[in-house]
């Protein structure tokens, strides 16, 4: 008789999750010499230990503490790029601008990017059928708590000028409920962060509006200013040209506004 299993509203653990995490760890540590000391089996054990046999609605930041310690990686604090609802362009940018880092350019972010995982209380099984949805089931689920934990720490590490890429095509360009709006903004350290610079990415070819005047951007400016951090904003009217100019800054067409 099959055991009763909790049905959650969200998709289940990504297939071949253990193999994927281990393979990503090995690949990352091979590419990044400063992380060659990392024992990927220990990393997987710590990752697994954070959620296996635990109720998937009762995960805490402390559960991820051993993984956070094993994944310690000093990031140049003045080269941090945050993003909200525009991950692909942010990643394309750091692939070209190699000295800048999104969270997913770190080992911990790279391991978990686009994956889903959860376990079941009191069994060592990984749940491949369903996992808790943040809205419909619970917020303290393994995936949400992981991203909240690493995002908080990533923002805490930032200094000088911090950049954030925002999606100008969304109804809320800045969303207080996004990871950026609810976690990262509030964990920038005013003692060492001088300025948050927002890059608002335009979607439409003929969109010449100044999206830095959008009410949600003004809301972001207000939140940041109250935290004694300066705020600046730039429109990126042509994201394709923007990337091209990052690749080839000497190009004559790159002196004009992008």
């Amino acid at each position: 008789v099959p055991r009763w299993r909790q049905q959650w509203s969200g998709p289940g653990t990504t297939k071949r999750f253990p193999e994927t995490v281990l393979a990503r760890c090995v690949k990352y540590t091979e590419i990044h010499p400063e992380m060659r000391h990392v024992d990927c089996q220990s990393v997987w054990d710590a990752f697994k230990g954070a959620f296996i046999s635990k109720h998937p609605c009762n995960i805490t930041e402390e559960d991820y503490q051993p993984l956070m310690k094993l994944g310690t990686q000093t990031v140049p604090c003045n080269k941090i790029l945050l993003w909200s609802r525009i991950k692909d362009l942010a990643h394309q940018f750091t692939q070209v601008q190699r000295d800048m880092f999104t969270l997913e350019d770190t080992l911990l972010g790279y391991l978990a990017d686009d994956l889903t995982w959860c376990g079941e209380f009191n069994t060592s099984k990984i749940n491949y059928q369903s996992c808790p949805d943040w809205r419909k089931d619970c917020s303290n689920n393994p995936v949400s708590v992981f991203w909240k934990t690493v995002s908080r720490r990533f923002a805490e590490a930032a200094c000088d000028v911090v950049h954030v890429m925002l999606n100008g095509s969304r109804s809320k360009i800045f969303d207080k409920n996004s990871t950026f709006g609810s976690v990262e903004v509030h964990n920038l350290q005013p003692e060492k962060v001088q300025t948050l610079e927002a890059w608002v990415i335009h979607g439409g070819r003929e969109d010449s509006r100044d999206l830095c005047q959008d009410p949600t951007i003004k809301e972001l400016e207000s939140i940041i200013s109250k935290r004694n951090i300066q705020f600046s904003c730039k429109n990126i009217y042509r994201p394709d040209k923007f990337l091209q100019c990052v690749k080839n800054p000497e190009d004559s067409s790159c002196t004009s506004e992008i």
Partner: nanobody
Framework: QVQLQESGGGLVQPGGSLRLSCAAS????????MGWYRQAPGKQRELVAA???????NYADSVKGRFTISRDNAENTVSLQMNSLKPGDTAVYYC??????????WGQGTQVTVSS
């Protein structure tokens, strides 16, 4: 320039108490997970006690119930209260600051000797 400066070590009789303190400069202590490690002659460095940035603590089995770690973020210090000391606690004690993305730092160490 990041500095972790330990103080409070010394010679104490078995059953006695000491309070070690670690003063941090050049870092925002509140975002760091802090720990006390010790190294006895000819042995590996081992974790004694740790406190996360959110205040959760954990201890080596050998010191549970005897040692207490605490932090004062306003003063940028972390302390280790050591009671019921035993000869086996004799070691150099090191302060450690660890942040997933902001770096790992060590103090120079302070000697603790438990002997009658």
């Amino acid at each position: 320039q990041v500095q972790l400066q330990e103080s409070g070590g010394g010679l104490v009789q078995p059953g006695g108490s000491l309070r070690l303190s670690c003063a941090a400069s050049g870092i925002i202590l509140r975002i760091y997970d802090m720990g006390w490690y010790r190294q006895a002659p000819g042995k590996q460095r081992e974790l004694v006690a740790a406190i996360t940035s959110r205040g959760s603590t954990n201890y080596a089995d050998s010191v549970k119930g005897r040692f207490t770690i605490s932090r004062d973020n306003a003063e940028n210090t972390v302390s280790l209260q050591m009671n019921s000391l035993k000869p086996g606690d004799t070691a150099v004690y090191y302060c450690n600051a660890d942040h997933t993305f902001a770096g790992v730092y060590w103090g120079q160490g302070t000697q603790v000797t438990v002997s009658s």
